[in-house]
């Protein structure tokens, strides 16, 4: 299948380039120069301008009167100006503002709590399975298997800290080497980026909002995937992460530190622990092949226990089996020895909803998964709604300028690095990269933060989560200190290496362009967002896992042809965009491929047919259902009943927008179809009533 949908036969103009700063959008050339074309016809060669590969601009030459979909929307203030209000109006306005702030903080609180419960739900549903992934002996020899296990486990438990703590305990117990643990940590880094991608799906109701939110969320995914793509082979070949971290750990004589400060958890824990409490040791025990743990429930029942260490006398077949020669005797009939045992006495039960239900983990997990997703979605909608009403006119202008404006020349380049520090600091405060990036997603969606600014914030978040892990490692007991610190440092240096790869030079900021490309596709074909999520976080890792279990030969036998095809397609695209004349006429565009291999249109028809029943019986009772409905059926009319997904885009359906050259390594060699309708038509997607 061709790498991106609707790959046209547009040719670059070799004589002319449109230069532009990385973060800026070039002005669209004159429309008259362009030639429109349809899907499957051999259209005449189009003369268009080629953007430099470091540009984050889309490859769509839209009509000049149309706004760039990536430009931040202007949030108009329709209300009465402050100066025009009377005293009563001013007081009312002030209290409204205070009320909105309280509501915003309230919804934000429940949003973070729902993320925590979502993580618990995932652990209940897939935690034991996740633990069993770790007990696979092939991890030691197969870094690729380690990587996908890291992805799958983190996706299943919705927490990179859980999966890394399992890895730490396995390394401490010598069940895993640091070398084998590094790919798992890389995988955990990928897995943790699913949370904000799920959050982005909640903004599916508004195309332009969804475009930005989804791109803003997936910039994290692409950064992690690309970093692994480059750094895993480097690590396997050189073991640089292992060597650097080993030198650091050995050169310092660390003393056990304080526990990593729980800042956000202090506020959220009182609420979340009333919903459910988990015994996370069970997953670790399963990972460490503890047979008893497989029958244990993850739902914590007893919160107050008394542990009494005592020695009990046990019979042994002969005195040779004694635990210690000095602790051995016979009573003339049986041989006895002393064994140290720990008696656990349950004192007080936990106080959460599920403590007395005795439901299986899967049932509790499913209930919590549905409820947390509903709360998450509801809170997100309300946050977006409140922010939308607050961030209007002058307020929006000030905030947008503060966040998105660069430092004055010649220090403009420093802005991004400051954003990285801010992202790291904020993540350190909230103690979770998932929480920080998930909170960032709706802000990108409503247009408060640009993707260009969100990118360094996300990178900083990746660093922030590792500093928390380093602090936690320093607080771990003596036997686990070395391994946990080395793993935390591996995580840290992996992210630093990734930033050095994909941030300093604007040309290398591939994750931004890839995310924008995916944002464009997903805005047009909203089902593709779910498809992307399933493919990248479940199917690819599970396929690699399955092939790895079958053995190296099978993995290489299947993997090499797949990698070869991908490289072939990328090389072909490179030649098509850079020097198409060296290619035979047939290979100068993708028209030689059947439509289903180069366009999402036929697939869209299939999905539309498959979800046709949802269009007829679309549940539009509430905004939450509506969003899910819109995502499934991708239909403009399905939710008209409650004006939730009002979509005035049919008028533009017939129009076409000329395509620019298929830029190298850009997800943006896409036509009108992937670009989606113009945002002007999407301005009224907010629910008028809940």
């Amino acid at each position: 299948m061709a790498p991106w949908p609707e790959l046209g036969d547009a040719q670059p103009n070799p004589d002319k380039y449109l230069e532009g700063a990385a973060g800026q959008q070039p002005t669209a050339p004159d429309k008259s120069k362009e030639t429109n074309k349809t899907d499957n016809t051999e259209a005449p060669v189009t003369k268009i301008e080629l953007l430099p590969s470091y540009s984050t601009a889309t490859l769509i030459d839209e009509p000049t009167e149309v706004d760039d979909p990536w430009n931040l929307p202007t949030l108009q203030d329709s209300g009465i100006k402050w100066s025009e209000r009377d005293t009563k109006g001013k007081i009312l306005c002030f209290f409204q503002g205070i009320g909105r702030l309280i509501l915003l903080l309230g919804f934000l609180y429940f949003f973070v709590c729902s993320l925590d419960i979502l993580s618990s739900a995932f652990q209940l549903v897939g935690g034991k399975m996740a633990g069993q992934f770790f007990s696979n002996s092939s991890i030691m020899s197969n870094p690729l298997l380690g990587l996908v296990i890291g992805v799958l486990v983190t996706v299943l438990v919705q927490s990179s800290s859980t999966s890394t703590s399992i890895v730490v305990s396995m390394v401490s117990s010598s069940l895993l080497t640091v070398r084998a643990a590094i790919p798992i940590i890389m995988g955990a880094n990928i897995g943790t980026s699913i949370t904000n991608t799920i959050v982005a799906l909640m903004q599916v109701g508004d195309r332009s909002e969804f475009r930005r939110a989804f791109a803003g969320a997936t910039v994290h995914d692409f950064f992690n995937w690309l970093s692994v793509l480059v750094l895993l082979p480097v690590e396997v070949a050189t073991h640089y992460l292992e060597i650097i971290t080993q030198l650091i750990v050995e050169s310092f004589h660390f003393k056990n530190g304080e526990d990593a400060p729980d800042l956000l958890k202090v506020i959220t824990k009182p609420f979340t622990k009333l919903i459910v409490q988990l015994d996370k040791k069970v997953i670790s025990q399963i990972a460490m092949n503890d047979e008893k743990a497989k029958n244990k429930s993850l739902v914590k029942i007893w919160c107050k226990t008394f542990t009494n260490k005592t020695q009990i006398n046990v019979t042994v077949p002969s005195t040779a089996n004694c635990t210690s020669p000095s602790l051995c005797w016979t009573d003339g009939i049986q041989n006895w020895t002393m064994k140290n045992v720990t008696y656990k006495e349950n004192i007080a039960k936990c106080q959460h909803i599920f403590v007395n239900f005795h439901l299986p983990d899967l049932a509790v997990g499913t209930i919590l998964l549905i409820l947390s997703l509903l709360v998450l979605c509801g809170c997100l909608i309300m946050i977006v709604k409140i922010l939308g009403s607050v961030l209007k006119g002058q307020v929006a202008t000030v905030i947008k300028k503060t966040i998105n404006t660069d430092f004055p020349f010649p220090f403009a380049w420093l802005t991004g690095y400051l954003a990285i520090l801010v992202g790291a600091g904020m993540t350190f405060i909230v103690q979770s990269s998932s929480v920080f990036t998930s909170a960032l997603t709706p802000l990108i969606g409503i247009g408060v933060i640009t993707i260009e600014r969100a990118y360094p914030l996300t990178l900083g978040s990746n660093i922030g989560t590792t500093t928390t892990a380093i602090l936690a490692a320093l607080a771990s007991p003596g036997n686990a200190l070395r391994s946990s610190l080395q793993i935390a440092l591996c995580h840290f240096f992996f992210n630093i290496s990734g930033i050095l790869l994909w941030y300093p030079i604007p040309f290398t900021r591939l994750p931004i362009r890839m995310a924008k490309g995916l944002g464009n596709i997903s805005a047009k074909y909203r089902w593709f967002a779910v498809f992307y999520l399933i493919i990248f976080f479940f199917l690819i890792p599970l396929t690699v896992f399955g092939l790895s279990l079958a053995g190296w030969r099978v993995l290489v036998g299947v993997g090499v042809p797949v990698v070869f095809i991908i490289i072939l397609v990328l090389c072909l695209r490179l030649l098509q965009s850079r020097c198409p004349r060296v290619l035979p006429k047939k290979l100068q565009n993708w028209n030689f491929l059947p439509l289903w291999m180069r366009s999402l249109k036929p697939w869209d028809a299939v999905v539309s047919k498959f979800t046709g029943c949802f269009q007829m019986r679309c549940c539009c009772c509430c905004r939450v259902c509506c969003r899910a409905c819109c995502l499934l059926c991708d239909c403009p009319k399905c939710c008209r009943c409650s004006k939730c997904c009002e979509d005035l885009e049919e008028a533009q359906e017939g129009q076409d927008v000329p395509v620019k050259a298929p830029e190298t390594f850009d997800n943006i060699t896409i036509s009108r179809e992937a670009q989606g309708e113009v945002p002007a038509s999407d301005s009224k997607t907010e629910c008028t009533a809940l």
Epitope: N313, T315, T319, P325, S326, L327, C328, W329, T330, D331, G332, I333, N335, W336
Partner: antibody, heavy 120, light 107 residues
Framework: EVQLQQSGPELVKPGTSVKISCKTS????????IHWVKQSHGRSLEWIGG????????NYKQNFRGKAALTADKSSNTAYMELRSLTSEDSAVYYC?????????????WGQGTSVTVSS | DIVVTQSHKFMSTSLGDRVSITCTAS??????VAWYQQKPGHSPKLLIY???TRHTGVPERFTGSGSGTDFTLTITNVQSEDLADYFC?????????FGVGTKLELK
């Protein structure tokens, strides 16, 4: 009060058998092992064997296998030792003693002893 | 079988003296050793078990020590009621074996 009350002295002919009893009181019979010890010539002690009344499991010193047979009756809290094919060598004082099952506290209570005299 | 040896069949002492009765096992028995006191015409009575643990009701003047193969029963401030036979017993492996005994008597 812990008590191990043994049956009275026995005067028996060679080649015959004798059954000595050890009636216990003041403790849970089934939680203990009842051992039998031989003391001849008023000096050295020799372990014969032991029985776990709870399940009837026994063990004997090699040279007493076939010579001694240990039994226990849980209902009457009594242990028995039968000595077969008696010879003058078997003339001695026989003691029963209790040992707490699963503990290393040794033989903490003894019976008063039963004197067996083998004489024609 | 483990052979338990009590080298002194007789030991003479004076009232109020300190006396040490020794016992040697033919192989390592850890601390699985007990000491019994038997007065003439009476049944044996447990004094010390697990080499050094005093049985309930036993006066503090009786102390046990040792591990492995060499063990000692020490009586400080010998009283007239302490004049008796003393047996050591190993219970490391079956069969249980006793020493021949040491008779404590007045000088």
């Amino acid at each position: 009060e812990v008590q191990l009350q043994q049956s009275g002295p026995e005067l028996v002919k060679p080649g015959t058998s004798v059954k000595i009893s050890c009636k216990t009181s003041g403790f849970f019979f089934t939680e203990y092992i009842i051992h039998w010890v031989k003391q001849s010539h008023g000096r050295s002690l020799e372990w014969i064997g032991g029985i776990i009344p709870n399940n009837g499991v026994t063990n004997y010193k090699q040279n007493f296998r076939g010579k001694a047979a240990l039994t226990a009756d849980k209902s009457s809290n009594t242990a028995y030792m039968e000595l077969r094919s008696l010879t003058s060598e078997d003339s001695a004082v026989y003691y029963c003693a209790r040992w707490r099952n699963g503990y290393y506290s040794a033989m903490d209570s003894w019976g008063q002893g039963t004197s067996v005299t083998v004489s024609s | 079988d483990i052979v338990v040896t009590q080298s002194h069949k007789f030991m003479s002492t004076s009232l109020g003296d300190r006396v040490s009765i020794t016992c040697t096992a033919s192989q390592d028995v850890g601390t699985a050793v007990a000491w019994y006191q038997q007065k003439p015409g009476h049944s044996p009575k447990l004094l010390i078990y697990w080499a050094s643990t005093r049985h309930t009701g036993v006066p503090e003047r009786f102390t046990g020590s040792g591990s492995g193969t060499d063990f000692t029963l020490t009586i400080t401030n010998v009283q007239s009621e302490d004049l008796a036979d003393y047996f050591c017993q190993q219970y490391r492996t079956s069969p249980l074996t006793f020493g021949v005994g040491t008779k404590l008597e007045l000088k």
